[in-house]
């Protein structure tokens, strides 16, 4: 009933809507100053008809 922790992203901080990542939880990654986010800044935990819940996207990267 929950997603796994999507992990930290180097050179960023993250804002978590709920500590245990239940379905509907979001994680937002914000890159440190001077770094550019590549990928999806907001991940949402989704339920699935088959299988365990999964994040809507992969964690992004923060690049110089």
């Amino acid at each position: 009933t929950s997603c796994h922790d999507p992990g930290d992203v180097e050179h960023s901080r993250r804002l978590i809507s709920s500590p245990k990542f239940p379905v509907g939880a979001t994680v937002q990654y914000i890159c440190d100053q001077g770094f550019v986010l590549m990928g999806s800044s907001i991940l949402t935990c989704h339920d699935r008809q088959a299988g365990s819940p999964k994040w809507s996207d992969r964690a992004p990267k923060c690049l110089l």
Epitope: L37, M38, G39, S40, S41, I42, H46, R48, G51, S52, P53, K54, W55, S56, D57, R58, P60
Partner: antibody, heavy 121, light 109 residues
Framework: DVQLQESGPGLVKPSQSLSVTCTVT?????????WNWIRQFPGNKLEWMGY???????NYNPSLRSRISITRDTSKNQFFLQLNSVTTEDTATYYC??????????????WGQGTLVTVSA | DIVLTQSPASLAVSLGQRAAISCKPS??????????MNWYQQKPGQPPKLLIY???NLESGIPARFSGSGSGTDFTLNIHPVEEEDAATYYC?????????FGGGTKLK
């Protein structure tokens, strides 16, 4: 139903910038999904160029990162491709496409009809 | 980059028979229990059409004669029985690792 439509210049001169617009109807580009640009070269090779996420963040093919920009106009429900310093190798049909989510191991479920851009002096 | 090698490059199949198209990624496209491999059909003058996502899931509205299988570094698109309207070029596509890449295509005649 969601529909995507590309519009582009048709002909661009080498060293100039190429700009293509994707107009989306039937779905807000700020609601969900990633909104992608894919091109198909003469000879039919397909290349994913990059996307703009519904949140506004972007992801680019590293081979193009130095000269690509994908932006959007949320008021018009459009997203844009700009490719700088083009050469004849950038001649291709340019498609915009909407993704599925990663949790569905997604593919590109909706495509525009494509716009041919020729780079020539 | 993950290179997707499709074979054969072209394929002639009689109506009603089976067509099998192979796609072999240069490294695994599996992640967290799913295979991030998709298949498209493209006809001249049209954009690619999604047939199969996540290796084996049939996209809505696609006939059941299309099926996908495989995992890791070995995937197959099967069409059975082949119909006249299936004449097209078929592409595999991985979305497991940046940059997302496509196979070179297989032309079904």
């Amino acid at each position: 139903d969601v529909q995507l439509q590309e519009s582009g210049p048709g002909l661009v001169k080498p060293s100039q910038s190429l700009s293509v617009t994707c107009t989306v109807t039937g779905y807000s580009i700020t609601s969900s999904y990633t909104w992608n640009w894919i091109r198909q070269f003469p000879g039919n090779k397909l290349e994913w160029m990059g996307y703009i996420h519904y949140s506004g963040s972007t992801n680019y093919n590293p081979s193009l990162r130095s000269r690509i920009s994908i932006t959007r106009d949320t008021s018009k429900n459009q997203f844009f491709l700009q490719l700088n310093s083009v050469t004849t190798e950038d001649t291709a049909t340019y498609y915009c496409a909407r993704s599925r989510y990663y949790y569905d191991a997604y593919g590109f479920a909706y495509w525009g009809q494509g716009t041919l851009v020729t780079v020539s002096a | 980059d993950i290179v997707l090698t499709q074979s054969p490059a072209s394929l002639a199949v009689s109506l009603g028979q089976r067509a099998a198209i192979s796609c072999k990624p240069s490294q695994s496209v599996d992640y967290d229990g799913d295979s991030y491999m998709n298949w498209y059909q493209q006809k001249p003058g049209q954009p690619p059409k999604l047939l199969i996502y996540a290796a084996s899931n049939l996209e809505s509205g696609i006939p059941a004669r299309f099926s996908g299988s495989g995992s890791g570094t070995d995937f197959t698109l099967n069409i059975h029985p082949v119909e006249e309207e299936d004449a097209a070029t078929y592409y595999c596509h991985q979305i497991n690792d940046d940059p997302w890449t496509f196979g070179g295509g297989t032309k079904l005649k």
